[in-house]
Structure formats: structure tokens, C-alpha cells
Interface confidence: medium
């Protein structure tokens, strides 16, 4: 009864198509698969960024796989062939591992890469990124930003840089069609006459860095002798009402401060007839139904009522 063996996949490699971190892992079938013509061979692929404690594991019948990686670090991957039990009279057979690694040959010392990278997707419409210069670099150093997301044929360079002291320190992006809910890859590299500059890689999803506009059209309505309804409207732009959370700050007679977080565009406040003045402001943020994270908007303009009986009037300013 001879032991069944299978070879590992051939030509296992990690290919960088120039997408700033989105890499292809590819391989060829193992040698000597002739005995298993009736069998569908599977492959178990494991991969990770070097330094990560956990491997991602995929089982596939394909000869390729694609995923995003952090190119600031190296990548390691291993793969073996799996023969399902149907092919081997009862027990799954695994080959030995084929292994490969990939990394970008780093230029320059780590300190020369940009610091304090900060990107905000304003009102889910305009992406703006800024950075501060790396250490040990001269003022002649220029930084360049490249970006890619699935849907672009190739990585694009920023065409609208923001400068300070003659250096590129930020980028205003053009309209980014169909760019949310997918990984957005950025590389900032640099050139200097006197020394090489280390590249920096960043990956995020645009819906998670949205800073909305503040709410507008704040109003008061007296609902009853002891209740006032505060209302406002969603800010102009592409973000639907279902995507907002709001934070309200209410001041009554310059003393009481009420803060509340609500999911829709109204808030009912318990009050007394003695209330002489009422002011409130609101700000907005994209909620957990539309993103994993977000940035609070600026506060709205303040809306105040004073000195008039709220029961007589709905205020709109």
C-alpha cells in the first residue's frame, strides 16, 4: 500500500502591479498531477505582513489571489497543495510548503519619510491630505503623492499640490469616482539632491475619514407648556439623512448646559415657563450604519431665543 504524495505548487511568487500595496499572489499547479486527473486540487495559502502575529488563510482552487498589504513592511507567504479525501481513499493529503517573500527595497533612512500624515474626506466629496516634512531633509526636498483604488487603471499622481516654503506639503484630490467602501492606497515619496528619501505607504477607506458640513436651519417650536422641540436640517451634499449622528449643546439662561447625542434631526427639551433665554448648536458625524469611523463637523451657527414667549411663536433664523 504505497503512500500518496503530492508536490507543492510551482513558481509561487508575489507580484507588485504598481498599485501601492495591492499585490497579486500567484502560482502554477504542482508537478506530477497525472495520477489525480479526476481530482480537483485545492491550495491552502497563508500570508501576512512581516511582524504581524497572525496569518491570513485562504483555501482556493484558483492559481492566484489578490489582497492589500502594508508596503512599509515586508510580506511573507506560503502555500501548499491539498488533495481532498475523495482523491485519496479517505484522508486529505498535503504537500510541503512553498514559500516566498516580497518587500520594497527601502531608499533613505526611516526618519526622512513624511510625518503626521492626515487625510480628511470633506462632506464625502473632497479629499484633502497633508503631511509634515521628514527629518534630516533639506528644504529642497520635494514630496510626491501617488494614489490608487480599485477601478483606476494605474496609480495616479496628485495634480494639485499645496505648498509651504516651496515644498509640497499637501494634496487636493480631484473628484474620486466610486472610491468609497474599498481600500484607498497612498504612497508619499520624495526626491532630494543630497540624500534619498524613504517612501511612506498609507491605506484607508474614504467613508471612515468623512468630516461633514454642520447642520443648517436650526429652529425652535413650543410643543407644550413644558416642552420645546429643537429641529435642524441635514447639511447640503451627498450624505443621506440615515447616515448622520448629531451632538447638541443647549444653554438655558446662560447656566444649564445640556449635551445630547441623537440619531435624527429633532430633540425635545423639557423646560419651564421661566426660561428667559435658550441657545443651541448642533454638529454632525457619519454614523455606524454608514462607516466604521468619522470626524465631527464644526458646530453649526448658534440659534437663540430670548425674551419672548415661545408659546406664541415658532422661531426660525
Amino acid at each position: 500500500d504505497t503512500e500518496i504524495k503530492v508536490n507543492p505548487p510551482q513558481d509561487f511568487e508575489i507580484v507588485d502591479p504598481g498599485y501601492l500595496g495591492y499585490l497579486y499572489l500567484q502560482w502554477q499547479p504542482p508537478l506530477s498531477l497525472d495520477h489525480f486527473k479526476e481530482c480537483t486540487v485545492e491550495y491552502e495559502l497563508k500570508y501576512r505582513n512581516i511582524g504581524s502575529e497572525t496569518w491570513k488563510t485562504i483555501i482556493t482552487k484558483n492559481l492566484h489571489y489578490k489582497d492589500g498589504f502594508d508596503l512599509n513592511k515586508g510580506i511573507e507567504a506560503k502555500i501548499h497543495t491539498l488533495l481532498p479525501w475523495q482523491c485519496t481513499n479517505g484522508s486529505e493529503v498535503q504537500s510541503s510548503w512553498a514559500e516566498t517573500t516580497y518587500w520594497i527595497s527601502p531608499q533613505g533612512i526611516p526618519e526622512t519619510k513624511v510625518q503626521d500624515m492626515d487625510c480628511v474626506y470633506y462632506n464625502w466629496q473632497y479629499l484633502l491630505c497633508s503631511w509634515k516634512p521628514g527629518i534630516g531633509v533639506l528644504l529642497d526636498t520635494n514630496y510626491n503623492l501617488f494614489y490608487w483604488y480599485e477601478g483606476l487603471d494605474h496609480a495616479l499622481q496628485c495634480v494639485d499640490y499645496i505648498k509651504a516654503d516651496g515644498q509640497n506639503i499637501g494634496c487636493r484630490f480631484p473628484y474620486l469616482e466610486a472610491s468609497d467602501y474599498k481600500d484607498f492606497y497612498i504612497c508619499v515619496n520624495g526626491s532630494s539632491e543630497n540624500k534619498p528619501i524613504r517612501s511612506s505607504y498609507f491605506t484607508f477607506q474614504l467613508q471612515n475619514i468623512v468630516k461633514p458640513l454642520p447642520p443648517v436651519y436650526l429652529t425652535f417650536t413650543r410643543e407644550s407648556s413644558c416642552e420645546i422641540k429643537l429641529k435642524w436640517s441635514i447639511p447640503l451634499g451627498p450624505i443621506p439623512a440615515r447616515c448622520f449622528d448629531y451632538e447638541i449643546e443647549i444653554r438655558e439662561d446662560d447656566t444649564t448646559l445640556v449635551t445630547a447625542t441623537v440619531e435624527n434631526e429633532t430633540y425635545t427639551l423639557k423646560t419651564t415657563n421661566e426660561t428667559r433665554q435658550l441657545c443651541f448648536v448642533v454638529r454632525s458625524k457619519v454614523n455606524i450604519y454608514c462607516s466604521d469611523d468619522g470626524i465631527w463637523s464644526e458646530w453649526s451657527d448658534k440659534q437663540c431665543w430670548e425674551g419672548e414667549d415661545l408659546s406664541k411663536k415658532t422661531l426660525l433664523r
Epitope: Q115, D116, D118, V120, L128, C129, S130, K132, I162, K163, A164, D165, I169, G170
Partner: nanobody
Framework: QVQLVESGGGLVQAGGSLRLSCAAS????????MGWYRQAAGEQRELVAS???????NYADSVKGRFTISRDNAENTGYLQMNTLKPEDTAVYYC????????????WGQGTLVTVSS
């Protein structure tokens, strides 16, 4: 109006120490990125130390272990402590501040001369 004023430069013997200060007005130092550049005669201005908005410090290889950058947010002042000075540290030192986040302003002091004699 933003103003940065450096002080603390001077003549010092090799192996000695100096502490440069950068007093800021018109800008909130807390959370701002701050860097110390230096420019030797006939050379370009080079960034030798910085402190990020998250208070992470970075140093050029040539000053690592000898220079320490810090700030006092209450005083709105940044500092560069320079120990074991060498003649090649001779330069005009400039303080540079850039407000937090998506701000594209860059503010400079007038510079303070540090001369290290052998």
C-alpha cells in the same frame, strides 16, 4: 499675527551645551508640529529635530543622542537642548511651527546663531 522668537544661541566650546528656546505667540503650540532647522554657511536649511502633533520626537542621525526637542504647552514655548556640541553643529538654528492637521501654514523664527569653537 503669528510670531516665533528664538533665543539661547551663542558661542560655546566643543563638548559644551546650549538650550535654544522658541517662544510662540498667535498660534496654539499644543498639538502643533514643531521642528528645528539649521543652516550652516553656504549650505541649505536642514531639519534636525521635530516633535509631531502626537508628541513623537524625531532626530537626524547627526544629532541623535545629543539633542533633545521638547515643548511646554502652558508657556507656548519649544526647546532644543543641545549637549556634547561639535564644531560641525555651528549654524543658524531656526524654529518652524505648523498648526495641527490640515493646515498648510508654516511659520518661522528669525534664527539664532550657534557657534561651537574647537
Amino acid at each position: 499675527q503669528v510670531q516665533l522668537v528664538e533665543s539661547g544661541g551663542g558661542l560655546v566650546q566643543a563638548g559644551g551645551s546650549l538650550r535654544l528656546s522658541c517662544a510662540a505667540s498667535g498660534i496654539i503650540f499644543s498639538g502643533a508640529w514643531m521642528g528645528w532647522y539649521r543652516q550652516a554657511a553656504g549650505e541649505q536649511r536642514e531639519l534636525v529635530a521635530s516633535i509631531t502633533s502626537g508628541d513623537i520626537t524625531n532626530y537626524a542621525d547627526s544629532v541623535k543622542g545629543r539633542f533633545t526637542i521638547s515643548r511646554d504647552n502652558a508657556e507656548n514655548t519649544g526647546y532644543l537642548q543641545m549637549n556634547t556640541l561639535k564644531p560641525e553643529d555651528t549654524a543658524v538654528y531656526y524654529c518652524n511651527a505648523r498648526p495641527r492637521g490640515l493646515s498648510f501654514s508654516s511659520y518661522w523664527g528669525q534664527g539664532t546663531l550657534v557657534t561651537v569653537s574647537s
